[in-house]
């Protein structure tokens, strides 16, 4: 088989026939050096998954539940292309599983026990697997058989397709539990009707169900959605209040050597020639000899899944949790109100050492998880491998786009009620050597720059955002002659000045000596012309405050700030000479962990925070020899956010807009993946 062949897996005679037609029609429109199709027939989707894993086939299209199976070891497949529905302008690749209730019913998600439930059908995604999977650990024991446990949890249900003889309570609201539209409460519309008629208290459906059944907004306003954080929201706020976000239909391939670019090239050309309303003789999204053959008949086209996205991220934490609960059937010994240990994400081995010491001292409250980059840490928090970390504002933005929430803010100024008063922020500055007296904000072109890291606030987003407004392009590596911006592409001129050895060169973690505030300042001291840091960086590393050999003899007076008006000022005049105000670093977590992270961190800072005076004989949470490990070393406390509890509110409109403008210059693969899930 030539290298540019995609071996498509078919699961029936009809699919194999359509696959052969797909192959022949593609041959007729694609040049001989382009991608081609070969067909492999297997007896089932699971056989197809195994065949792809074994390199006997390359691709198959799967529903969400099977994407989960495909991802599990030893298959290790990943999503590569998504079908979309709706229009090209507003493509829908996901639907939302929701819990709909009547507005005046007054209960929350954690109060569903004893209520009456309406389901689309037994074993169906939005109507059964997701809600029951998420409620699984609240079900009464024994949880097997599952139908019995569910019957004992709700006071009555309509779950079409259930066995009404063995589990009569599941058919209480729809006698007979008929498994077709003959049952008025079957399917999405039926489950909603079950709620609407007053038979049930909650309907488990998808987000579009209520819009399809109630055209009138006034009627829709009589209903609400139950959110997982035990609040309610209007039905049109389903993106912020759902049980799970579920991909509709997805092409999967091997994670390694999976031909994902070739598969995309093939399907992209296929949709150009044989997509919706393109060709009479062969239609990709039509199944004359059946239904949904190879692809869903209702699909409108394909979108490439960002390469950073693995199956866990694609399916989302809630969906994976629900399906894993159902499949594995394991729950904590006894559900208690106690918080589980918080799994802190540590960057590289230096942070891990500090985290380990914290973990030992925390007596079971803190566990540690390692990752090599901040984005890897954010991804681990998203999928539940980790729970929390403290982030620079630039990464709070990315984490927010990925569905995480800020929970506490670092405060840097001593005050009487530090924990109750989140600060306005710190100043992002541009520092130069006093001796380079001709250097101003207006003549930085061709100079050598030092950055904390790509994507961080003071070191990147603010200065590069301002620069972008001036030069109107993203080629910052051409603007500066060379520099160190950890996280840049290794062959970029913005890695040239970096000092990390071997694979650590230009890495966005402490293995790169010029990483972070202190690192960027060191880069200026030793090699650079300008450093983009925070206003406290120079005083924190001069006058003997940093004992490291490179810093111990530095004098604050030898450095100046660049002001945006083209003038320069002494370092202590940062309030009148800065690039912008930056939001303080903040701790982020998943929404489901928010309360526990808040509680445990407040306990931890009372034990190990800035009230500890002797850090040589005690563990100090906010100290790491000027290296800002886990938290900034100048943190005085972690402060409550009050109502600034979303990334937009926390960062502020101005900063969110500034980072949004820089998005076109973004190299963040994680941001790309997260905006695919939520544009």
């Amino acid at each position: 088989v030539p290298d540019k062949t995609v071996r498509w897996c078919a699961v029936s005679e009809h699919e194999a026939t359509k696959c052969q037609s797909f192959r022949d029609h593609m041959k007729s429109v694609i040049p001989s050096d382009g991608p081609s199709v070969a067909c492999v027939k297997k007896a089932s989707y699971l056989d197809c998954i195994r065949a792809i894993a074994a390199n006997e086939a390359d691709a198959v299209t799967l529903d969400a539940g099977l994407v989960y199976d495909a991802y599990l070891a030893p298959n290790n497949l990943k999503p590569v292309v998504a079908e979309f529905y709706g229009s090209k302008e507003d493509p829908q690749t996901f639907y939302y599983a929701v819990a709909v209730v009547k507005k005046d019913s007054g209960f929350q998600m954690n109060q569903l026990r004893g209520k009456k439930s309406c389901h689309t059908g037994l074993g169906r995604s939005a109507g059964w697997n997701i809600p029951i999977g998420l409620l699984y650990c609240d079900l009464p024991e024994p949880r097997k058989p599952l139908e019995k446990a569910v019957a004992n949890f709700f006071s009555g249900s309509c779950a079409p397709c259930a066995d009404g003889t063995d589990f009569p309570q599941l058919c209480q609201l729809c006698p007979g539990c008929g498994c077709s539209t003959l049952n008025q409460y079957f399917g999405y519309s039926g489950a909603f009707k079950c709620l609407k008629d007053g038979a049930g208290d909650v309907a488990f459906v998808k987000h579009s169900t209520i819009f399809e059944n109630l055209a009138n907004k006034a009627d829709r306003d009589q209903y609400e959605l139950l959110c997982l954080d035990n609040t309610r929201k209007p039905v049109d706020e389903y993106k912020d209040c759902h049980l799970a976000q579920v991909p509709s239909h997805t092409v999967v391939a091997r994670s390694m050597g999976g031909k994902e670019d070739l598969i995309w090239e093939l399907l992209n050309q296929a949709q150009e020639h044989f997509g919706k309303d393109k060709s009479k003789e062969f239609q990709l999204f039509s199944s004359p000899h059946g239904k949904d053959l190879l692809f869903k008949d209702s699909a409108h086209g394909f979108l490439k899944v960002p390469p950073r996205m693995d199956a866990k991220m694609y399916l989302g934490y809630e969906y994976v949790t629900a399906i894993r609960n159902l499949r594995e059937g394991t729950c904590p010994e006894a559900p208690t109100d106690e918080c589980k240990p918080v799994k802190w994400c540590a960057l590289s081995h230096h942070e891990r050492l500090k985290c380990d010491e914290w973990s030992v001292n925390s007596v079971g409250k803190i566990e540690c998880v390692s990752a090599e980059t901040t984005e890897d840490c954010i991804a681990k928090i998203m999928n539940g491998e980790a729970d929390a970390m403290s982030l620079d504002g630039g990464f709070v933005y990315i984490a927010g786009k990925c569905g995480l929430v800020p929970v506490l803010a670092e405060n840097y100024n001593k005050s009487d009620n530090c924990e109750d008063t989140p600060e306005a922020g710190y100043f992002a500055i541009a520092v130069v050597k006093k001796s380079a007296s001709d250097l101003t904000w207006d003549n930085l072109k061709g100079k050598k720059s030092c950055h904390t890291a790509v994507g961080r606030t003071a070191g990147w987003n603010i200065p590069m955002g301002l620069l972008y407004n001036k030069i109107n392009h993203c080629r910052f590596d051409e603007f500066f002659s060379e520099g160190c911006a950890p996280g840049s592409k290794k062959d970029s001129s913005l890695c040239k000045l970096c000092m990390g050895s071997g694979l650590n060169l230009c890495e966005p973690n402490n293995k790169e000596g010029y990483y972070g505030y202190t690192g960027a300042f060191r880069c200026l001291v030793e090699k650079g012309d300008v450093a983009f840091v925070k206003h406290q960086t120079v005083p924190q590393n001069t006058g003997g405050k940093n004992p490291d050999p490179w810093a111990k003899n530095l004098n604050e007076k030898d450095y100046e700030l660049l002001c945006l008006d083209g003038t320069r000022k002494p370092v202590e005049e940062y309030a009148n000479c800065h690039l912008a105000r930056a939001p303080n670093h903040a701790v982020v977590t998943r929404k489901d962990k928010e309360a526990c992270v808040h509680k445990i961190l407040r306990q931890q800072q009372h034990l190990f925070g800035s009230n500890v005076t002797d850090c040589s004989g005690n563990f100090c949470l906010f100290r790491s020899e000027t290296k800002d490990l886990l938290f900034r070393d100048d943190t005085v406390c972690l402060a409550k956010l009050h109502d600034r509890n979303t990334y937009e509110k926390y960062l502020g409109e101005e900063y969110v807009k500034a980072v949004g403008n820089l998005r076109k210059c973004s190299t963040s693969s994680l941001l790309e993946a997260c905006t695919f899930r939520r544009p």
Partner: nanobody, 117 residues
Framework: QVQLVESGGGLVQPGGSLRLSCAAS????????MAWYRQAPGQQRELVAG???????KYADSVKGRFTISRDNAKNTLYLQMNSLKPEDTAVYYC???????????WGQGTQVTVSS
């Protein structure tokens, strides 16, 4: 800063026991946290067990119930009692007191533990 020297490693059969010692060149009474780490070939160094001055302990999940960490401040020594050893416990074991900071990579020679039949 005190110097730390590990000893007590060796070759042992699966199911066997070893007791590692870490002798400090000075007083450990004022040192808050001490810990044992291990590093297997091609792996990251990982925390095995830690102990605070007050006697609170923490163990990696993989060694819970098999290993016991203790310290004797009078003898300025940290110990790791290792029971029911498994082949996957094979590694070089290091002790640390974190006093050199998290940034400098000062680790002693360590002591090799090999579990094999």
């Amino acid at each position: 800063q005190v110097q730390l020297v590990e000893s007590g490693g060796g070759l042992v059969q699966p199911g066997g026991s070893l007791r590692l010692s870490c002798a400090a060149s000075g007083s450990i009474a004022s040192i808050n946290t001490m810990a044992w780490y291990r590093q297997a070939p091609g792996q990251q160094r990982e925390l095995v067990a830690g102990i605070t001055r007050g006697g609170s302990t923490k163990y990696a999940d993989s060694v819970k119930g098999r290993f016991t960490i203790s310290r004797d401040n009078a003898k300025n020594t940290l110990y790791l009692q290792m029971n029911s050893l498994k082949p996957e416990d094979t590694a070089v074991y290091y002790c640390t007191d974190y006093s050199r900071g998290y940034y400098q990579d000062y680790w002693g020679q360590g002591t090799q533990v090999t579990v094999s039949s």
